[in-house]
Interface confidence: medium
Amino acid sequence: MNSFNYTTPDYGHYDDKDTLDLNTPVDKTSNTLRVPDILALVIFAVVFLVGVLGNALVVWVTAFEAKRTINAIWFLNLAVADFLSCLALPILFTSIVQHHHWPFGGAACSILPSLILLNMYASILLLATISADRFLLVFKPIWCQNFRGAGLAWIACAVAWGLALLLTIPSFLYRVVREEYFPPKVLCGVDYSHDKRRERAVAIVRLVLGFLWPLLTLTICYTFILLRTWSRRATRSTKTLKVVVAVVASFFIFWLPYQVTGIMMSFLEPSSPTFLLLNKLDSLCVSFAYINCCINPIIYVVAGQGFQGRLRKSLPSLLRNVLTEESVVRESKSFTRSTVDTMAQKTQAV
């Protein structure tokens, strides 16, 4: 069954090596977790704690402002995407602890591991929307004065979520629960029914739409924004540059291992040594991608501290200051400090 992929999202091919055999002495196979799996568990635990608390705080701070403040709408939606993904972590964590055994049933198998992919697409589409917003603020300030409103922002977010759901459907549809009887194990994964071309197509679409195309467009977009804002003495600051780079880079940094291993595995033969090595690293790559779900609140706080000089305010008020200040378009076509600051925030992992 060379097309069955197990564990979390869609890579990490089916592998029934790790088992919990009864009446068998403890050995490296049956009762010990691989080092990459242990690292993945540590990352999952940290991401869950920081991601749930941090994103809940961001949602709480931005929800009150989202009716009137466009930046709050962006950050609210990103935080919701991250928060949803974090909710799947305890189950994914439990599955790895149980050597990838999946006792949670078919519905959970279809839905929960798909959440990180929904998060990936939702985040990148929301980031693209936010980047477009930043771009328009810099290059079309008059248009923004006339048309940039909360209603349009919510419509843009709805479109982003709709497209994200659409792009997650293939993963959702191909997910199945699969059971071995010797050694006894239930696995959750993707079954492409021996169709290697279909598997490659899914991997390529995910790489292009979830990584390469956004990387290209956002790099171009932020290059133009930075060139324009840097040319203004008032906003020429390495601080702004660093934060903007953090905003754009983190998404791609944390998704890179998952995307690279995924595309490689879709083209490799399951018997090749490289394939087998990548297969062992699957959970670690997924956990690395999951860092995106907790990095936003951290960047918001770090950025907020930077703008405040030092942490003088309470965390909610600091976050409110960073996330809900509205960008004011000036007639001179430059924009306020708050615009530069909020543009620099990590809106999730672009």
């Epitope: 069954m1 060379n2 090596k17 196979t29 199945v176 699969r178 071995e180 006894p184 239930v186």
Partner: antibody, heavy 121, light 112 residues
């Protein structure tokens, strides 16, 4: 189409060794345990052990430790079982088997056609 | 090791009549994950064993509905509602809950 094709019948003298092969196709050979089962003439089935071709890890039924040695070659998707110090009681049909797996898409249980090993002086 | 005891060892049946084979294990076959890994195989003359029933009562793909399995813990039964000529062979029960995997000694079904 999944297939497990075993090598042909062997006749060996007591004290000799024999190596039975099992060529797999149609599934991820490297990532799945391969089992070996013995069936003496007119007798029941006995599980010998299993090998994980991906890294050569093995698990043996205590009864066959020292008698059977399982190996695998992932480049040819072939599993091997060598029986050493053959005695008359080793005369049997030996099967390779990829035991049951069930999913919403598929349900399979693969057995090779069996290899008859006859030990006779 | 878990000892699997089948009865009867020989079962002559008239075509169209029902048949029943019993299998008893020396230990409970309930796995820590809650499943019971007790399976039934049929080995037709000159062939490899083929799976009929898995996990006590689940018919394997392509197996006629005249075959059914039941039982729990240590006692299990395979029933054939109406025996047909193609059902002739040796029936084995097997457990994969505990290592090593073990089989019953087999029940030979023959037509009267």
């Amino acid at each position: 189409q999944v297939q497990l094709v075993q090598s042909g019948a062997e006749v060996k003298k007591p004290g000799a060794s024999v190596k039975v092969s099992c060529k797999a196709s149609g599934y991820a050979f490297s990532n799945s345990w391969m089992n070996w089962v013995k069936q003496a003439p007119g007798q029941g089935l006995e599980w010998i052990g299993r090998i994980y071709p991906g890294d050569g890890d093995t698990k043996y039924n205590g009864k066959f430790k020292g008698k059977a040695t399982m190996t695998a070659d992932t480049s040819t998707s072939t599993a091997y079982m060598e029986l050493s110090s053959l005695r008359s009681e080793d005369t049997a049909v030996y099967y390779c088997a990829r035991f049951l797996l069930i999913s919403t898409v598929t349900a399979v249980d693969y057995w090779g056609q069996g290899t008859l090993v006859t030990v006779s002086s | 090791d878990v000892v699997m005891t089948q009865s009867p060892l020989s079962l002559p049946v008239t075509l169209g009549e029902p048949a029943s084979i019993s299998c008893r294990s020396s230990q409970s076959l309930v796995h820590s994950n809650g499943n019971t890994y007790l399976h039934w195989y049929l080995q037709k003359p000159g062939q490899s064993p083929q799976l009929l029933i898995y996990k006590v009562s689940n018919r394997f793909s392509g197996v006629p509905d005249r075959f059914s399995g039941s039982g729990s813990g240590t006692d299990f039964t395979l029933k054939i509602s109406r025996v047909e000529a193609e059902d002739v062979g040796v029936y084995f029960c097997s457990q994969s809950t505990l290592v090593p995997l073990t089989f019953g000694q087999g029940t030979k079904l023959e037509i009267k």
